[in-house]
């Protein structure tokens, strides 16, 4: 168990126990170095999830040793259009691959400050971080 | 700045406080209670990217008042497979439409006890927890 | 071979209903899809709406929030109901059949004869 | 929506003489993942429906005669008649079915000169 929020000491425990802790152990997927209409613009047969979507994406790693948690997986599409379902390699410009993003809870460790002042080691400030979790194979919006 | 992890005290503050403070402010959307199949198995034009999508999906809430956050949403496919691009309203069997899940570090709240047995307050006990976060339209895999 | 014949009132009042129907005779409605196109008098061609024999239906956005086409596999029938009708409405409507090859709809054929609807009080 | 655009509006062509008509879509109908046109010719003669002539933009339905052709690629169509008939007088319309809603050229008069 770990406690229930009040002051942290200085002296490192538990806060940076509990920030190595509350890391997402694993990533979605190991991020990979591929770029938009690279080779990997074609939805495969076999894998993860998102290299078998017809809007493929890869992860990018985000990671802030003061946020909690301290690692984040970005989302970015590989395609601008859709994989066609026929092939699962040319695009069908029917449909976008569109980011779903999601504003995802963080903490961010920030020295507290006594009433005279001093340091009295860390505290965590709540803050709303937006997070693409993937990409979705979307019409394209109709304009009225 | 709420403060860094260490016990409570069981009066509820501010654990009370601090769960309601943490739980994710708007849904995604508003849940719905659309069937597999419904009117709903369409890809929509405009709106929101879930309804959008060719493999669109409802969100589901799930409270849990002991947990934090308390209030997570899961996806709820509206349709087995995708629907076709072309139309926007019929499927096309050359498309799966999955889950994508997604294991969030949540929070439990667990009464704390001291040395003696005693009734301390209130902990947290970290757990990963699924959740589905979107539908997305997938080729079949391919079994070798 | 099919064949299809539109059937419905020849006249209509503005704000009122047109209601149509189209028979489909020598086949089954089953396997495809159903389309309603109308012409204005002197004018071109345009798509409605379209109905498969399950019910799932797609609306020229044009239309949308007026049109309502139906189906009813039991008597190999499918309708339309356009409301609010105004004399811009006044035209030739058309059933016709699309078939659909390899899970994509494709072109119209056959065609009805067409029915004259005119909207006037 | 995409739009068709034919031209011109209306054509006089002696008989025996080829008629060419014009279809241009807002957006490409070619589909690379089997490298069709989604594109339709239809003929329309007076008091008649529309009738199917070509689709896949270059295949004629059968029953249709060899004077009549269609060609062209992405967004610009060309329907051919080699050599103009009598019984060919009649308004010819393109059609896209690449995506709803399905959308319809303004026509083409074809008329003997």
């Known amino acids: 168990y770990s406690h229930w929020p009040s002051c942290c000491p200085s002296k490192g425990y538990p806060s940076e126990e509990l920030l190595r802790w509350s890391t997402v152990p694993v990533p979605p997927l190991k991020p990979a170095s591929l770029d938009f209409h690279s080779v990997s613009c074609r939805a495969s047969e076999d894998g993860p999830l998102n290299s078998r979507a017809i809007s493929p994406w890869r992860y990018e790693l985000d990671r802030d040793l003061n946020r909690l948690p301290q690692d984040l997986y970005h989302a970015r599409c590989l395609c601008p259009h859709c994989v066609s379902l026929q092939t699962g390699s040319h695009m069908d410009p029917r449909g976008n691959s569109e980011l779903l993003y999601h504003n995802q809870t963080v903490f961010y460790r920030r020295p507290c400050h006594g009433k005279k002042g001093n340091h009295k080691g860390y505290c965590l400030e709540r803050r709303l971080y937006r997070v693409s979790l993937a990409c979705v194979c979307v019409r394209p919006r109709v304009m009225g | 700045y709420s403060h860094w992890p260490s016990c409570c005290p069981s009066k509820g503050y501010p654990s009370e406080e601090l769960l309601r403070w943490s739980t994710v402010p708007v849904p995604p959307l508003k849940p719905a209670s659309l069937d597999f199949h419904s009117v709903s198995c369409r890809a929509s034009e405009d709106g929101p990217l879930n309804s959008r999508a060719i493999s669109p999906w409802r969100y589901e809430l799930d409270r849990d008042l002991n947990r934090l956050p308390q209030d997570l949403y899961h996806a709820r496919c509206l349709c087995p497979h995708c629907v076709s691009l072309q139309t926007g309203s019929h499927m096309d069997p050359r498309g799966n439409s999955e889950l994508l899940y997604h294991n969030q570090t949540v929070f439990y709240r667990r009464p704390c006890h001291g040395k003696k047995g005693n009734h301390k307050g209130y902990c947290l006990e970290r757990r990963l927890y699924r959740v589905s976060l979107a539908c997305v339209c997938v080729r079949p895999r391919v079994m070798g | 071979q099919v064949q299809l014949q539109e059937s419905g009132p020849g006249l209509v009042k503005p704000s009122e209903t047109l209601s149509l129907t189209c028979t489909v005779s020598?086949?089954?409605?089953?396997?495809?899809?159903w389309s309603w196109i109308r012409q204005a008098p002197g004018k071109g061609l345009e798509w409605i709406g379209f109905?498969?024999?399950?019910?799932?239906?797609n609306y020229n956005p044009s239309l949308k929030s007026r049109v309502t086409i139906s189906v009813d596999t039991s008597k190999n029938q499918f309708s339309l109901k356009l409301n609010s009708v105004t004399a811009a409405d006044t035209a030739v409507y058309y059933c016709?059949?699309?078939?659909?090859?390899?899970?994509?709809?494709?072109?119209?054929?056959?065609w009805g004869q067409g029915t004259l609807v005119t909207v006037s009080s | 929506d995409i739009v068709m655009t034919q031209s011109p509006a209306s054509l006089a062509v002696s008989l025996g003489e080829r008629a060419t008509i014009n279809c241009k879509s807002s957006q490409s109908v070619l589909y690379s993942s089997n490298n069709k046109n989604y594109l339709a010719w239809y003929q329309q003669k007076p008091g008649q429906p529309p009738n199917l002539l070509i689709y896949?933009?270059?295949t004629r339905d059968s029953g249709v005669p060899d004077r009549f052709s269609g060609s062209g690629s992405g967004a610009d169509f060309t329907l051919t008649i080699s050599s103009l008939q009598a019984e060919d007088v009649a308004v010819y319309y393109c059609?896209?079915?690449?995506?709803?809603?399905?959308?319809f050229g303004q026509g083409t008069k074809v008329e003997i000169k």
């Open positions: 059609q896209q079915y690449f995506s709803t809603p399905w959308t």
């Open positions: 109905i498969d024999y399950s019910g799932s239906t």
């Open positions: 896949w933009s270059s």
């Open positions: 020598g086949g089954s409605i089953s396997s495809y899809f």
């Open positions: 016709a059949r699309q078939e659909i090859i390899n899970f994509e709809l494709n072109w119209f054929d056959p």
